[in-house]
Interface confidence: low
Amino acid sequence: SAPFSFLSNVKYNFMRIIKYEFILNDALNQSIIRANDQYLTAAALHNLDEAVKFDMGAYKSSKDDAKITVILRISKTQLYVTAQDEDQPVLLKEMPEIPKTITGSETNLLFFWETHGTKNYFTSVAHPNLFIATKQDYWVCLAGGPPSITDFQILENQA
């Protein structure tokens, strides 16, 4: 996976929460759910109440990047989605409050959010060639593309 040392001088400042309590569904219409206390997985749900609800916080880059940089938090918690390495599960990091400034190695908390029509992609800021992805019989992880699914639909107002 790509090293992120070249990003270490870029500073990201928290602006505001831009979305509350939304659900992420992958291209197979599987929703992201809590696999257990520390990771996420994807499953086809009859009842969307079981899906994880996320909040999305926006950050502004000191580099004046055109990309939208976001943090993903599980709604009503202090758990934040954290990237590891390629094919490793994304983790849930417990923090007392949303970080006001993120730089260096802490960029594993941040994702570039890109939209193409109804498709949403979340690229890791720490590993810019890797996406949040679902994978059959596996946790939600970071992946470069197929066979993992990297595009998501955002379902809002599910609260």
């Epitope: 809590r34 257990n36 206390d37 520390q38 994880v52 709604s75 009503k76 417990e94």
Partner: antibody, heavy 122, light 106 residues
Framework: QIQLVQSGPELKKPGETVKISCKAS????????MNWVKQAPGKDLKRMAW????????TYADDFKGRFAFSLETSASTAYLQINNLKNEDTATYFC???????????????WGQGTSVTVSS | IQMTQTTSSLSASLGDRVTISCRAS??????LNWYQQKPDGTVKLLIY???RLHSGVPSRFSGSGSGTDYSLTISNLEQEDIATYFC?????????FGGGTKLEIN
């Protein structure tokens, strides 16, 4: 069944170091975070820290930064609490407790160790 | 968020219905747990999310409440229920506990 078994009582002098263990069984250790909770004589229960059993990363409560270290031996499904430079006010019972989020957002500690008594006295 | 159990000790007779209360300093949206600590020190989760019984907990235990005020009820007190009961909020770090209510037999 799920069990957390802690090491036995400790009697230490001020300035010494103590290391307490908590061995988990009956579930997949890396799937659940582990808490350490302090109960000083006649005082409330106080959550000291939460340790991510996948990465080993700890989140400390404000009162427990500095002399306290939390570690794991994942292959043995064991968590450790180490207190350095012991002080009299460290005299307490220390519990490990498995963490779980119910309904995605409500945190509880669903299984507890039996507690380890640490007495610090000169 | 601070948790307050105003009654530090409570005396009751076997077979009694006993209610223990707990108050949060702000709304905790039902993220309230109850724990039992026996005289030998062992701690067990009894109730999570205000009213849900943890596995293996007898049905004589129940929980209720909302907003900032919560309670634990034991409908038919038994000898084995002699213990200290702690509430804990599970909404916001550091997930504070109440001071405990010690239940004794008359």
């Amino acid at each position: 069944q799920i069990q957390l078994v802690q090491s036995g009582p400790e009697l230490k002098k001020p300035g010494e170091t103590v290391k307490i263990s908590c061995k988990a069984s009956g579930y997949t250790f890396r799937n659940y975070g582990m808490n350490w909770v302090k109960q000083a004589p006649g005082k409330d229960l106080k959550r000291m820290a939460w340790i991510n059993t996948y990465t080993g990363e700890s989140t400390y409560a404000d009162d427990f930064k500095g002399r306290f270290a939390f570690s794991l031996e994942t292959s043995a499904s064991t968590a450790y609490l180490q207190i350095n430079n012991l002080k009299n006010e460290d005299t307490a019972t220390y519990f490990c407790a498995r963490g779980i989020y119910y309904y995605g957002s409500s945190y509880a500690m669903d299984y507890w160790g039996q507690g380890t008594s640490v007495t610090v006295s000169s | 968020i601070q948790m307050t159990q105003t009654t530090s000790s409570l005396s009751a007779s076997l077979g009694d219905r006993v209610t223990i209360s707990c108050r949060a300093s702000q709304d905790i949206s039902n993220c309230l747990n109850w724990y039992q600590q026996k005289p030998d020190g062992t701690v067990k989760l009894l109730i999570y999310y205000t009213s849900r019984l943890h596995s293996g907990v007898p049905s004589r235990f129940s929980g209720s409440g909302s907003g900032t005020d919560y309670s634990l009820t034991i409908s038919n007190l038994e000898q084995e229920d002699i213990a200290t009961y702690f509430c804990q909020q599970g909404k916001t770090l550091p997930y504070a506990f109440g001071g405990g209510t010690k239940l004794e037999i008359n």
